[in-house]
């Protein structure tokens, strides 16, 4: 699993000892202002309402497991998901729904109705996003459900469908 | 008023004195890198264009008063509002508008037209969001106006309609 | 070119020497936790798919040149663009597309179909946004392409169309 991360991460570096002990600049650079983030693109082939994600995205201080982002450091996180839909309109309108789940509980959802004219058109594009600001403990899981996952456009726009989290304020 | 906040907030903790004076890790943990944030859900019953919010959301370094978030620490803030609409389409199209106001001035608005086919349908869902990056002084007010507040879906989706701010960079 | 910035920016202030050497609060306030951000509004008159921006927006640690934001400090950036469209519907549906480019490469795009009923209506409003979390090196360029730039509403809503970036985590 690739973990794109900022070089020289200060994690787990002792503040005392070594050549750093008298150098405040050195000490400050190693200070415990932890940052954690993830930015994953949706998996190419989706076959269920709980979305899967590409493990080879950016993961720093966050794990990915079975469709879940798993938090490793407690704190206040900003969570955002954005999906690109491509709908072949049937005879009726279609409700596109994106659900953000924390520990399997739906914490936030976004809905948009497309194909509302009831006409069978060639295609309709729709972009849907949802954000959340929440305090997450260690091992909290973040996941996304989409009932109409078949309309998520993973072929034309492989980079458009993302789930991202970043730590805003830790609890140290 | 409940103020969900991260434990061990460093606010107003002296940097010198006590057992901390010789321990740089301790000192750094108490350093003055202030964080302020809010995350409020819309009130259940809306009766005017200026939206009201539930006071029992997350408030840390920000006050809530009469539909306004009131800033307590100056700095550059990221402000984001997201609303979920459910429209029973009349015979005509409907323009949904979300206005973000700073000190009563409309600083940003988002508009989306729904029911554009002019057909009376059962319902149309629409999600609307707006963000702003702005420098806010102490006592600056942040509020949201929605002309078509009657379409904000507070019953089916009580958690979806939120106003959030967080301090990106303070002026210390 | 205007560069609105937070006062007392810690950039390039030495950590040692002067009256600050013994005062940890002073030292911490000057610590190298660099922040960079930009918040630009779209130019009034657009004449090509690559959007131009008003140079008199917020620029701090980021340059603007020929439609590009140019990164000056490496790190993980949050990039967000939001556009307000106003479409006089023709006889057919219209696909609105927003492309975020990094070094001229399309990294993310958002599409929405409007006027899907195929009826010539007076107008249809649509708001489109796109975000990206990406590691950017020095001199990386960030730009936005919109094929249907003629529909971007710069007259009714002069403040609505923005491109913003802010540094989440630097590489020191």
């Amino acid at each position: 699993q690739r973990t794109d991360s900022i070089p020289n991460s200060p994690d787990n570096i002792p503040l005392r000892g070594g050549n750093c002990s008298e150098d405040l600049l050195c000490i400050l650079k190693r200070a415990p202002f932890k940052k954690s983030w993830a930015y994953l693109q949706v998996a190419k082939h989706l076959n269920k309402t709980k979305l899967s994600w590409n493990k080879d995205g950016i993961l720093h201080g966050v794990r990915y497991q079975d469709g879940n982002l798993v938090i490793q450091f407690p704190g206040l996180y900003f969570i955002i998901c954005q999906l690109q839909f491509l709908v072949q309109c049937p005879n009726n309108s279609v409700d596109l729904k994106l659900e953000l789940l924390i520990n399997k509980h739906i914490k936030k959802q976004a809905l948009v109705t497309v194909c509302e004219s009831g006409m069978q058109t060639k295609h309709v594009y729709q972009n849907l996003s949802q954000f959340l600001l929440d305090y997450l403990q260690v091992n909290t899981t973040v996941s996304v459900n989409v009932d109409t996952f078949q309309y998520i456009d993973t072929s034309t726009f492989p980079l458009e469908n993302v789930l991202s989290v970043f730590l805003y304020s830790n609890s140290d | 008023q409940r103020t969900d906040s991260i434990p061990n907030s460093p606010d107003n903790i002296p940097l010198r004195g006590g057992n901390c004076s010789e321990d740089l890790l301790c000192i750094l943990k108490r350093a003055p890198f202030k964080k302020s944030w809010a995350y409020l859900q819309v009130a259940k019953h809306l009766n005017k264009t200026k939206l009201s919010w539930n006071k029992d959301g997350i408030l840390h370094g920000v006050r809530y008063q009469d539909g306004n978030l009131v800033i307590q620490f100056p700095g550059l803030y990221f402000i984001i509002c997201q609303l979920q609409f459910l429209v029973q389409c009349p015979n005509n199209s409907v323009d949904l508008k979300l206005e973000l106001l700073i000190n009563k001035h409309i600083k940003k608005q988002a508009l989306v037209t729904v029911c554009e086919s002019g057909m009376q349908t059962k319902h149309v869902y629409q999600n609307l969001s707006q963000f702003l990056l702005d420098y806010l002084q102490v006592n600056t007010t942040v509020s949201v106006n929605v002309d078509t507040f009657q379409y904000i879906d507070t019953s089916t989706f009580p958690l979806e309609n939120v106003l959030s701010v967080f301090l990106y960079s303070n002026s210390d | 070119q205007r560069t609105d910035s937070i006062p007392n920016s810690p950039d390039n202030i030495p950590l040692r020497g002067g009256n600050c050497s013994e005062d940890l609060l002073c030292i911490l306030k000057r610590a190298p936790f660099k922040k960079s951000w930009a918040y630009l509004q779209v130019a009034k008159h657009l004449n090509k798919t690559k959007l131009s921006w008003n140079k008199d927006g917020i620029l701090h640690g980021v340059r603007y040149q020929d439609g590009n934001l140019v990164i000056q400090f490496p790190g993980l950036y949050f990039i967000i663009c939001q556009l307000q469209f106003l479409v006089q519907c023709p006889n057919n549906s219209v696909d609105l597309k927003l492309e975020l480019l990094i070094n001229k490469h399309i990294k993310k795009q958002a599409l929405v179909t409007v006027c899907e009923s195929g009826m010539q209506t007076k107008h249809v409003y649509q708001n489109l946004s796109q975000f990206l979390l990406d590691y950017l090196q020095v001199n990386t360029t960030v730009s936005v392409n919109v094929d249907t730039f003629q529909y971007i509403d710069t007259s009714t809503f002069p403040l609505e169309n923005v491109l913003s970036v802010f540094l989440y985590s630097n590489s020191d």
Epitope: - | N103, K104, H105, Y135 | R2, D4, S5, D56, S155, T156
Partner: antibody, heavy 124, light 107 residues
């Protein structure tokens, strides 16, 4: 009590220079944007120039662009207008006005206080 | 530049009358509009900001409305001290611009 007192006006020949000052008191000067507005005899109001709280955002009317320079000294609670290459049409009463906002990212919020003005007459 | 057009340029009214002055912007300015009152030989006085918000100390008979391009200043019951010239101003973008003014005279 908020007070804005303009000074530096007077009679000047075309092509010459003049520097106007505005002394502010009764509020935190460095927390607000400031502006210059002028009014020619018997005419309406014309905005001349504005400056944000930290001088990062500065704007001018087309009629004075390249000739006038606005500045401020927050330590002295003072606003200035350096007027070069003066013309007869610059003859006016010049007002200093305080903004309710800071001027950062268009945080202009309207003028809430005005000075009494200083008269500038450009004539040969 | 954004042009601000005020109408009428002058009007005559009596004490107790309801007076309405309109201001139109050449393009959208959201609600970034102010109204000022000026009496002969005096500095302008701020009445309204953000199109409809009353400056502190201004009597409640003054009210403002509008958003986008069309705005209105209303004096619900004209008082003797209200006879003056009124200006609108946009401050959404440089250059800030004023309307030409409306002179309210005694009938």
């Amino acid at each position: 009590e908020v007070q804005l007192v303009e000074s530096g006006g007077g009679l000047v020949q075309p092509g010459r220079s003049l520097r106007l000052s505005c002394a502010a008191s009764g509020f935190n000067f460095d927390d607000y944007a400031m502006h210059w507005v002028r009014q020619a005899p018997g005419k309406g109001l014309e905005w001349v120039s504005g400056i944000s709280w930290r001088s990062g955002n500065i704007g001018y009317a087309d009629s004075v662009k390249g000739r006038f320079t606005i500045s401020r000294d927050n330590a002295k609670n003072s606003l200035y207008l350096q007027m070069n290459s003066l013309r007869a049409e610059d003859t006016a009463l010049y007002y200093c006005a305080k903004d309710k906002g800071i001027g950062f990212n268009w945080n202009y919020e309207g003028f809430d206080y005005w000075g009494q003005g200083t008269l500038v007459t450009v004539s040969s | 530049d954004i042009q601000m057009t005020q109408s009428p340029s002058s009007l005559s009214a009596s004490v107790g009358d309801r007076v309405t002055i309109t201001c139109r912007a050449s393009q959208g300015i959201s609600n970034h509009l102010a109204w000022f009152q000026q009496k002969p030989g005096k500095a302008p006085k701020s009445l309204i900001y953000a199109a409809s918000s009353l400056q502190s100390g201004v009597p409640s008979r003054f009210s403002g409305s509008g958003s986008g391009t069309d705005f209105t200043l209303t004096i619900s019951s004209l008082q003797p001290e209200d006879f003056a010239t009124y200006y609108c101003q946009q401050y959404v973008t440089y250059p800030l611009t004023f309307g030409g003014g409306t002179k309210v005279e005694i009938k």
